[in-house]
Amino acid sequence: LNTTILTPNGNEDTTADFFLTTMPTDSLSVSTLPLPEVQCFVFNVEYMNCTWNSSSEPQPTNLTLHYWYKNSDNDKVQKCSHYLFSEEITSGCQLQKKEIHLYQTFVVQLQDPREPRRQATQMLKLQNLVIPWAPENLTLHKLSESQLELNWNNRFLNHCLEHLVQYRTDWDHSWTEQSVDYRHKFSLPSVDGQKRYTFRVRSRFNPLCGSAQHWSEWSHPIHWGSNTSKENPFLFALEA
């Protein structure tokens, strides 16, 4: 067990996205049971959900969550003010925009109120845990006889996002994908006018403003071109 105890002004540092510590215990008891890991995601920098698997507890337990920001002006310990519940047991905490400081190290502490010594602390880099909303308002423009341009919008600062475009025709078994930087536009230079194309896009908070690994949900698809191939076996799967 790692028995480091973090305090709001501690000097511990780590390059990982999270760092887990547990309180030391003197004897075998319920205190030695590990607490579930807390997973936090910042949704579009509008709110953050920090959740844990409440069913991993041996008996239903309303675990409590405290948080602070390490080595910052916001290092005062805060209690969760908006718990999330699963079957009437606490399973998460929602923090609002004003409580989110992306570029300070976020420290989250989970505790069993019946066994105060049973607690676990994690340090998180919130700029790596941002998940943007799915791209919206996909539009297609014909640049020339055979060239299409796809544009979209994000409810976010566009320069902070990179994008992944996927497209395929009704005759394709799989998607073709292309990475797109913050410019949020994509050109397909050679379009077959006899085929029907489907496009979709997702976005990620990377690399300029953070280093998130998680993508947004896919956008609603947008279609272009002929829709006459009734015997095409992939058409219906595509629409599902």
Partner: nanobody, 127 residues
Framework: QVQLQESGGGSVQAGGSLRLSCVAS????????MGWFRQAPGKEREGVAA??????YYADSVKGRFTISQDNAKNTLYLQMNSLKPEDTAMYYC??????????????????????WGQGTQVTVSS
């Protein structure tokens, strides 16, 4: 490829002045935050001053003595340091962000806010 190159450091007597420059290539000055940080031996890197979106920000320890400015035409960030003290001795770094100085909460001096860093220029102030 963003590159930041600092210059202007050196040795000076207490009470003297220095002007640091940071030339940015591959990075366009705008409302994004650019800052000066410093790191003395055995100490953590700390914010000195930052500029972005028409606002300037200073650490309490340098207010009234240091001035941050930029020349958009030259794509250069400056730090004019007057009334220097021995405790100003440190390696000074220029840093550039892709967000505004206070965007997404927190403070202008949050190190993680800045994506790009220069190699640093040494400032030594003797008494």
């Amino acid at each position: 490829q963003v590159q930041l190159q600092e210059s202007g450091g050196g040795s000076v007597q207490a009470g003297g002045s220095l002007r640091l420059s940071c030339v940015a290539s591959g990075y366009t000055f705008s409302s994004y935050c650019m800052g000066w940080f410093r790191q003395a031996p055995g100490k953590e890197r700390e914010g000195v001053a930052a500029l972005g979106g028409g606002s300037t920000y200073y650490a309490d320890s340098v207010k009234g003595r240091f001035t941050i400015s930029q020349d958009n035409a030259k794509n250069t960030l400056y730090l004019q340091m007057n009334s220097l003290k021995p405790e100003d001795t440190a390696m000074y770094y220029c840093a550039a962000a892709w967000v505004a100085c206070l965007e997404f909460g927190g403070s202008w001096y949050d190190l993680a806010r800045y994506k790009h860093w220069g190699q640093g220029t040494q400032v030594t102030v003797s008494s």
